[in-house]
Interface confidence: low
């Protein structure tokens, strides 16, 4: 007796995947079915790859579900001005088949940028500076050539925005230098985007402070005492006179009498702490100490130097 042995399996790879039409966010594809391996093809899935993706990724299509008798579909939700290639995968009740060979590579068309820079912030810098920073927009979200940033800022509470155009996709920092910038003053800041197609949106407005002025007055009433052969305690008072420049902490400098001051060691305190302990010193040694206030702009003038000798070991 004769018998036919039919071996059913997942479909073979579809063939001739073609990009028929491409816009800024869509691509219309067509393909030919491969062998169904004796089990009807029930659906197709489309995958895409770009220079920015990790391997092949499934993409959204219209129709959302592509049945086995449909050989065209529109891929939606693509990023403008990105080079894409596509492939299709067929499936039947037995399983998912091998993917087709990739289509040709095609770039989507340009569009206005839509993604704003992340983490707009700033601060610091030198006197009379407003430093503004942000995270650059990834290339795949720039939506076109000629990408750049528009930095807008104004003193907090003022009406008029000052604008600066940075025609570089890599820009992530802008420094406004002007003698009228008062130390540690609040500014409203936002960063917008543009490309050859035009201007996109601005980031949400955030408040950034201009650069501080370093403390202008020295700490007062410096006093030091030996606690042991290895430890000294230093005390001081915040500046007596009105000090310009916020004080973030104090820097205590100490050096042995036989050493040069430029070889001094430094320790920093944080906040309004006005004493500190210096440890790991040598016994019966004369030390010189001085204290300065500091903030993000730098250190202020030094206090008078005081002397203290550690106890005998």
């Amino acid at each position: 007796a004769a018998a036919d042995l039919i071996v059913r399996g997942p479909p073979g790879p579809p063939e001739a995947v073609t990009i028929d039409e491409i816009t800024d966010t869509t691509a219309q594809l067509s393909w030919r079915p491969g062998p169904d391996n004796h089990s009807p093809i029930t659906m197709y899935v489309i995958q895409a790859r770009t220079p920015f993706s990790v391997g092949w990724q499934a993409v959204s299509t219209v129709p959302e579900l592509i049945d086995g008798k449909t050989f065209t579909a529109t891929v939606v939700g693509l990023n403008p001005w990105v080079e894409y290639e596509f492939r299709t995968v067929a499936a039947n009740v037995i399983g998912i088949g091998e993917p087709s060979r990739p289509s040709e590579k095609r770039r989507t068309e340009e569009a206005l940028p839509e993604v704003t820079p992340a983490n707009v912030s700033g601060g610091g810098g030198s006197k009379s500076e407003l430093v503004i920073t942000w995270e650059t927009v990834p290339e795949e979200l720039q939506n076109g050539r000629g990408f750049g940033y528009v930095v807008a800022f104004r003193p907090y509470g003022k009406m008029i925005w000052m604008l600066t155009v940075l025609a570089s996709a890599d820009a992530s920092r802008y420094v406004f230098r002007n003698e009228s910038v008062h130390p540690f003053s609040p500014f409203e800041v936002k960063v917008g985007v543009f490309n050859n197609k035009g201007e996109g949106p601005f980031s949400p407005t955030t408040v950034v402070y201009s650069a501080e002025e370093e403390p202008t007055k020295p700490p007062a009433s410096i006093f030091a005492r030996s606690l042991s052969a290895t430890d000294i305690e230093v005390f001081w008072a915040s500046p007596l006179e009105k000090n310009r420049g916020r004080i973030q902490g104090y820097e205590v400098k100490y050096w042995r009498h036989e050493d040069k001051e430029e070889n001094a060691r430094k320790i920093r305190t944080v906040g309004n702490q006005t004493s500190t302990k210096i440890t790991n010193l040598k016994g019966s040694v004369l030390y010189h100490l001085a204290v300065k206030a500091y903030n993000s702009a730098g250190t202020g003038p030094s206090s008078a130097t005081v002397n203290v000798t550690t106890r005998k070991p």
């Epitope: 104004r154 003193p155 509470g157 003022k158 009406m159 008029i160 000052m162 406004f176 002007n178 003698e179 009228s180 910038v181 008062h182 003053s185």
Partner: antibody
Framework: AVTLDESEGGLQTPGGALSLVCKAS????????MFWVRQAPGKGLEYVAE????????WYAPAVKGRATISRDNGQSTVRLQLNNLRAEDTGTYYC????????????????WGHGTEVIVSS | ALTQPSSVSANLGETVKITCSGS???YGWYQQKSPGSAPVTLI????NRPSDIPSRFSGSGSGSTGTLTITGVRAEDEAVYYC?????????FGAGTTLTVL
């Protein structure tokens, strides 16, 4: 002593343009914001425009926004107000004023005034 | 806009207080003796008095209110007094307070 001298305003025609210049002396001009303030006949003081010491920042009152331009020449110690598309309600005395601090947050910081110049907008 | 009384009166030698409200920043106080004459700055930034201004003029600011105080008012103090400040959107002056010395 600080002195601020405004140029003559005079009679202007509606729809025309006004240019006022203020010459400053007696202080480090580039370090201070400058203002133009005006007073209509029988009315109170009205803030018009402000410019920062370096000239990079300008602010305008709503009544003149889009019509006014304030600028400065730190080399010549002058500040200029250009007011276009003049209206009858622009009539008044225009004062040049100096901010009290190197970074001014509003008219509250004026510490010196010019003598004022009269502007009449009439056909 | 900034709000200040339209008029106040005082006898010679009395203390006068003129208030101003509506500023989100500091206040300044300006004296104008006749319309069209240049204003004179009495107080800037709430409390600072220019060196050529008599000490009988003083200023204070608390919250959203600024106050100009004239201690021992004189006949020559008769004038219109303007406050200046920032109303949250623009720099503004009050409508002015006329001081009459009796």
């Amino acid at each position: 002593a600080v002195t601020l001298d405004e140029s003559e305003g005079g009679l202007q025609t509606p729809g025309g343009a006004l240019s006022l210049v203020c010459k400053a002396s007696g202080f480090t001009f580039s370090s201070f914001n400058m203002f133009w303030v005006r007073q209509a006949p029988g009315k109170g003081l009205e803030y018009v425009a402000e410019i920062s010491g370096g000239g990079g920042s300008t602010w305008y009152a709503p009544a003149v926004k889009g019509r006014a331009t304030i600028s400065r020449d730190n080399g010549q110690s002058t500040v200029r107000l250009q007011l276009n598309n003049l209206r009858a309600e622009d009539t008044g005395t225009y004062y040049c004023a100096k901010s009290a601090d190197t970074w001014s947050y509003g008219a509250a910081t004026i510490d010196a005034w010019g003598h004022g110049t009269e502007v009449i907008v009439s056909s | 806009a900034l709000t200040q009384p339209s008029s106040v009166s005082a006898n010679l030698g009395e203390t006068v207080k003129i208030t101003c409200s509506g500023s989100s920043g500091s206040y300044g106080w300006y004296q104008q003796k006749s319309p069209g004459s240049a204003p004179v700055t009495l107080i800037y930034d709430n409390t600072n008095r220019p060196s050529d201004i008599p000490s009988r003029f003083s200023g204070s600011g608390s919250g959203s209110t600024g106050t100009l105080t004239i201690t021992g008012v004189r006949a020559e103090d008769e004038a219109v007094y303007y406050c200046g400040g920032y109303d949250g959107s623009t720099d503004v002056f009050g409508a002015g307070t006329t001081l009459t010395v009796l």
